[in-house]
Interface confidence: low
Amino acid sequence: IPVIEPSVPELVVKPGATVTLRCVGNGSVEWDGPPSPHWTLYSDGSSSILSTNNATFQNTGTYRCTEPGDPLGGSAAIHLYVKDPARPWNVLAQEVVVFEDQDALLPCLLTDPVLEAGVSLVRVRGRPLMRHTNYSFSPWHGFTIHRAKFIQSQDYQCSALMGGRKVMSISIRLKVQKVIPGPPALTLVPAELVRIRGEAAQIVCSASSVDVNFDVFLQHNNTKLAIPQQSDFHNNRYQKVLTLNLDQVDFQHAGNYSCVASNVQGKHSTSMFFRVVESAYLNLSSEQNLIQEVTVGEGLNLKVMVEAYPGLQGFNWTYLGPFSDHQPEPKLANATTKDTYRHTFTLSLPRLKPSEAGRYSFLARNPGGWRALTFELTLRYPPEVSVIWTFINGSGTLLCAASGYPQPNVTWLQCSGHTDRCDEAQVLQVWDDPYPEVLSQEPFHKVTVQSLLTVETLEHNQTYECRAHNSVGSGSWAFIPISAGAHTHPPDEFLFTP
C-alpha cells in the first residue's frame, strides 16, 4: 500500500501557502484528486510529488494515491483544506444527475473544518428544503440527499455560518430522473363494444407512467382522433385519459379502436372492436347435440351460449314434458358471463330419474324478442326381461318380453340342468332373434320387444333362458319346466310360477 507524506489524514493550510504531497510505493504510483489549478506533478519511479506554491480554496479536496501494479488495489488518501475566510465552499460540480431512489451527492467541499458545526443545505433564494428531504453532510465530500425523489429536482446552495452570517456556495442543480421501467401502462375500456345505431357510446383510453413525458392517442381504423386529454397525477404516476363520447353512433363509428402510448422506452398499443348494429339481437346456440342420451341415474349438464345486445331482460329453463309437470329447480340453473355480450347458461341435472326424461327448453328475452333452444333428453336403461309359457295356435311357446333403451337384442339359450343362469359349459343350444317384435316405442320411454320361442316338447331337466342386452347392460330370465307346469327364474330375485 502506498504511503503519503505528510502522514496525516487531513491538512489545513491558508491561501497562498506552499503544499507538497509526496507518495511512495513499491512500484510506480499515481495521484488522483479534484480538478484544480496550480498543481505541479513530479514523478520519480516509485515516488510522486504533487506540489503548489500558491494554494487556493479550489485546491480543497481529497487526494488519493494509488499503485496501479498492486494486485490488491491499495490506496492512501489525504484531505486538504485551504481555509479561505471569503470562500467557505469549493463546489466541484454545478449539475448533479441521478435516478430516483439513488443518493445524490452535492459536491460542495468545506474549506475550513472548523465551520462544520454551522453548515446547512438550502434551496436557492433561501427557500427551505422540501419536507421529507433526508440528507447528511461530510466536510470531505459535501451534502448527500438520500434516496432522491423526482420532486427534489431543484437548485441548491450550501450554507456556512461565518462570523454570525450565512455564506452561500454557488448553486448546484440537481436533476432526479424517473426510472422508467418501460412504455406507459395502458387501458382501453370497454374491451368490446356493441351499440344499436343512434345510441350513445363511450370509449376510454388511458395511459400512465412514472414520468410525465409520454404521449397517448386514440386511433379509429388508423385515423388518429382529436380528443381533449385529461391529465392527473396520483399514486406517484402521471395519468393521461382520452374519453371518446358518441351521442348517436352510426355505422361509420364502428371498427377497430387502438389506444397507443409511447415514451423514450418504446410504444404500447391495445385494441378493441366496436360493432354498430341496426337492431337488437339475441342468438342462442349450444356446443352440445340438442338430442341427448344419458343412462338413468347419471347426471347431465345442459349448456346454452347466448349472444345478445342489449342485455337479457329475462331467461329461464322450462321442462316441456312428457312426464311430470315438474320444472327444473332454480338452484340447478347457473349463469356465467364470458364477456359483456356473451353468456353461458347451464342446467345441472344430477342423478336422472325416469320421470326427468323429455324436452328441456332454455328461453331468453331482450328488446329483440324471445328465443328458445330445446334439448331432447332420452334416458338409457338396461334391459328388464320376463318369460312366460303359453300356447299360440296350439303350439307351446316361450314368450320373452324385454324392455330397455336403446332397443334390446334378444338371445335364447337352452342348457342342461336347472339353473338361474346358463353358463357356457351347460349350453346345449343358442338362438339369436335378430328381429324381435316391437311392442312399444314412444319417445323418451323404454322400448319393449317380444321374442317367441316355439318349443314342441319341454325337456324337464333343462333350463330355457332369455337374455337381452343393449349398450347399457343386459338382463335375463330363466324358465325351468317342472312336471306340474313350469317354473320361471328371474335372476336372483323371485320365483314365479304361472
Epitope: K224, A226, I227, P228, N245, D247
Partner: antibody, heavy 124, light 108 residues
Amino acid sequence: QVQLVESGGGLVRPGGSLRLSCAASEFTFDDYAMSWVRQAPGKGLEWVSAISWNGGSTNYADSVKGRFTISRDNAKNSLYLQMNSLRAEDTALYYCASTVEVAHRRLYKYLEVWGQGTLVTVSS
Amino acid sequence: QAGLTQPPSVSVAPGQTARITCGGNNIGSKSVHWYQQKPGQAPVLVVYGDSDRPSGIPERFSGSNSGNTATLTISRVEAGDEADYYCQVWDISSDHVVFGGGTQLTVL
C-alpha cells in the same frame, strides 16, 4: 400564451383569389382540428371550413364549397385558406380557430382559441 | 341542417341576471356552446358542452339545454359583460359548425 395570427387579407376584385394564412404558437398544433369562421361587417359569425388534425378530412359551408380550399402544414404550425372566384358577399373579417372535436356526453365540436382576424374585401 | 334562433337584443340592469336563449328543433339532443364578442375583438368561448366553463371564465356565466331551447345565464351582470353573444352547435349529419344569429346584450 396560446396564439393564432391570421394574415393574407386585403382588397381583391370579384373573381380574384387570395390565400389566407394562420400561424399557431404555444400549443400542440397537430393535436387540433382547425376552422375558418368569417364575419361580414355588422353581421354575425358564419362558419366557413374545417380540417382534421392531420388534414385527412376537410369540409366546407355550402356557400364556399368548390371555391375555397382549406389545408394545413403541421411542420410549420400553419393553417391556410385558398379562396378562388371571390364574390362581393365573401367580404368579411376571417378568423382561424382551434377546434376541439369530441368531448364528454356527446360528440360535438367547438372553437376554443380564436385569432384576431384578417379582413378580406371583395370589391370592383 | 340545424337553424339556431337567438333574440336580437337583451337588456339588463347591472347586478341583475341576464338570460339569452338559443332555439332549435330538439336542440336538447345536441351540445351547445356560447361565445362572447366585444366590439372590435375576436369571439371568446364562455361556455361549452351546454354548461362547462373554460378556465378563466367567471362562475357568473352558466348554461343549460333541454327540449328546444338552450339558455346562457349571466348572473350579477357587470358593465364589462356588454357584448354580442353567439350560440353554436355541431350538425352531425352535415359535419358543419352552425352559429346562431347573435344577441346583443346591453347593460343599462
